[in-house]
């Protein structure tokens, strides 16, 4: 068998809402993956499990089952959404995300994703992780790859 390549493309969109009373931030983050089947037979994408971390704390998890099949030498682009919650001991971030004197409220999140594929009864897991910028101050739609985390300073907390 040849390889199945998983490429995490980036954040497609991030939709934000707040609970003012609890100082809680809700971020619905939609990510895009490219999965390439380099084989001469179809493979099933059985599930995608994803989690998002902020400051080494898991703030959201998602699992998609029975997603799609990918034909021989084909590629599919898959979007998946992870609902995240920044609350409790991290709800001081509300103070940054709702600050109105700055226009972009980028926070750095670590996106982790594991894709499970099957073919001829054989199962294979491929994992990726990437740091990404997400604006926690407004709803944002990104050009793919636009939110990639570069080696720059994180916002002061």
């Amino acid at each position: 068998p040849r390889s199945i390549d998983v490429k995490y493309i980036g954040v497609k969109s991030a939709y934000v809402s707040y609970d003012v009373q609890k100082r809680t931030i809700y971020l619905n983050i939609t990510n895009t993956l490219n999965i390439t089947n380099n084989n001469y037979y179809s493979v099933e994408v059985e599930n995608i499990t994803a989690q998002v971390q902020f400051a080494k704390t898991v703030i959201g998890k998602a699992r998609l089952n029975n997603i799609t099949h990918i034909g021989p030498l084909d590629m599919k682009q898959i979007d998946y959404t992870v609902p995240t919650v920044i609350a409790e001991e991290m709800s001081y971030m509300y103070d940054f995300c709702t600050l109105i004197s700055i226009k972009v409220h980028n926070i750095v999140l670590m996106m982790q994703v594991t894709v499970t594929t099957t073919y001829f009864g054989h199962s294979e897991q491929i994992s990726q992780e990437r740091y990404q910028y997400v604006d926690c101050g407004r709803n944002t739609t990104y050009q793919l790859g636009q939110s990639e985390y570069l080696n720059v300073l994180q916002p002061q907390q």
Epitope: V20, Q21, K22, R23, E89, M90, S91, Y92, D95, F96, T98, L99, I100, S101, I102, P155, Q156, Q157
Partner: antibody
Framework: EVRLQQSGPELVKPGASVKISCKTS????????MNWVKQSHGKSLEWIVN????????FYNQKFKGKATLTVDKSSNTAYLDLRSLTSEDSAVYYC????????????????WGQGTSVTVSS | DIVLAQSPASLAVSLGQRATISCRAS??????????VHWYQQKPGQPPKLLIY???NLESGVPARFSGSGSGTDFTLNIHPVEEEDAATYYC?????????FGGGTKLEIK
């Protein structure tokens, strides 16, 4: 210099409404949340509401919902407090106060205050 | 609503001595390392003036004789050495959640 200039004293009849203003200068109006605070004669302070001047989102003390309405006019850098169905309980000094902030976070303390507007409700 | 109980209601302190004002919250007003309590000074006929924000940070232009401390539910404003111009009423305020509330005030008299 940051300034919050409030409108003058008001004497109104019970059941009437009043609109008091807070004209700001010396800073970017849309960069700071604005609050209103009530102080009855010889008493402590009561927070009424705060507003995001960018989008008009206002967050009220439930006690004042239906009594107070906060609006802003971005073109004149002015905040307004509307008080309706006035009773003697509403007689007080009303202050507008800007919410201060650090470089990258809100602190929710009120760093600049208007001089206060006295509202007297009497028949 | 979070209730802030200030004590004493009034106190008289000799010039140059220490004034200590307490503020107790009915529940914690801290999140992580941040404590959402602020202190104000008000003189008759004037609006309140911010002295201390986030429990212990001195507002710009406020003399260093003012200091704040505490976390969770118990907070203190200290003034040392007290000067004549410090005669005023002092209020604590929390901003941990809505609605923000103020303490009942402490009236400081200089002997």
């Amino acid at each position: 210099e940051v300034r919050l200039q409030q409108s003058g004293p008001e004497l109104v009849k019970p059941g009437a409404s009043v609109k008091i203003s807070c004209k700001t200068s010396g800073y970017t109006f849309t960069d700071y949340y604005m609050n209103w605070v009530k102080q009855s004669h010889g008493k402590s302070l009561e927070w009424i509401v705060n507003i995001n001047p960018n989008n008009g989102d206002a967050f009220y003390n439930q006690k004042f919902k239906g009594k107070a309405t906060l609006t802003v006019d971005k073109s004149s850098n002015t905040a307004y407090l509307d008080l309706r169905s006035l009773t003697s309980e509403d007689s007080a000094v009303y202050y507008c106060a800007r919410e201060g902030q650090l470089r990258l976070r809100r602190v929710y303390a009120m760093d600049y205050w208007g001089q206060g507007t006295s509202v007297t409700v009497s028949s | 609503d979070i209730v802030l109980a200030q004590s004493p209601a009034s106190l008289a302190v000799s010039l140059g001595q220490r004034a200590t004002i307490s503020c107790r919250a009915s529940k914690s007003v801290s999140i992580s390392v941040y404590t959402y309590v602020h202190w104000y000074q008000q003189k008759p006929g004037q609006p309140p003036k911010l002295l201390i924000y986030l429990a212990s940070n001195l507002e710009s232009g406020v003399p260093a004789r003012f200091s704040g401390s505490g976390s969770g539910t118990d907070f203190t404003l200290n003034i040392h050495p007290v000067e004549e111009e410090d005669a005023a009423t002092y209020y604590c305020q929390h901003s941990r959640e809505l609605p923000y509330t103020f303490g009942g005030g402490t009236k400081l008299e200089i002997k």
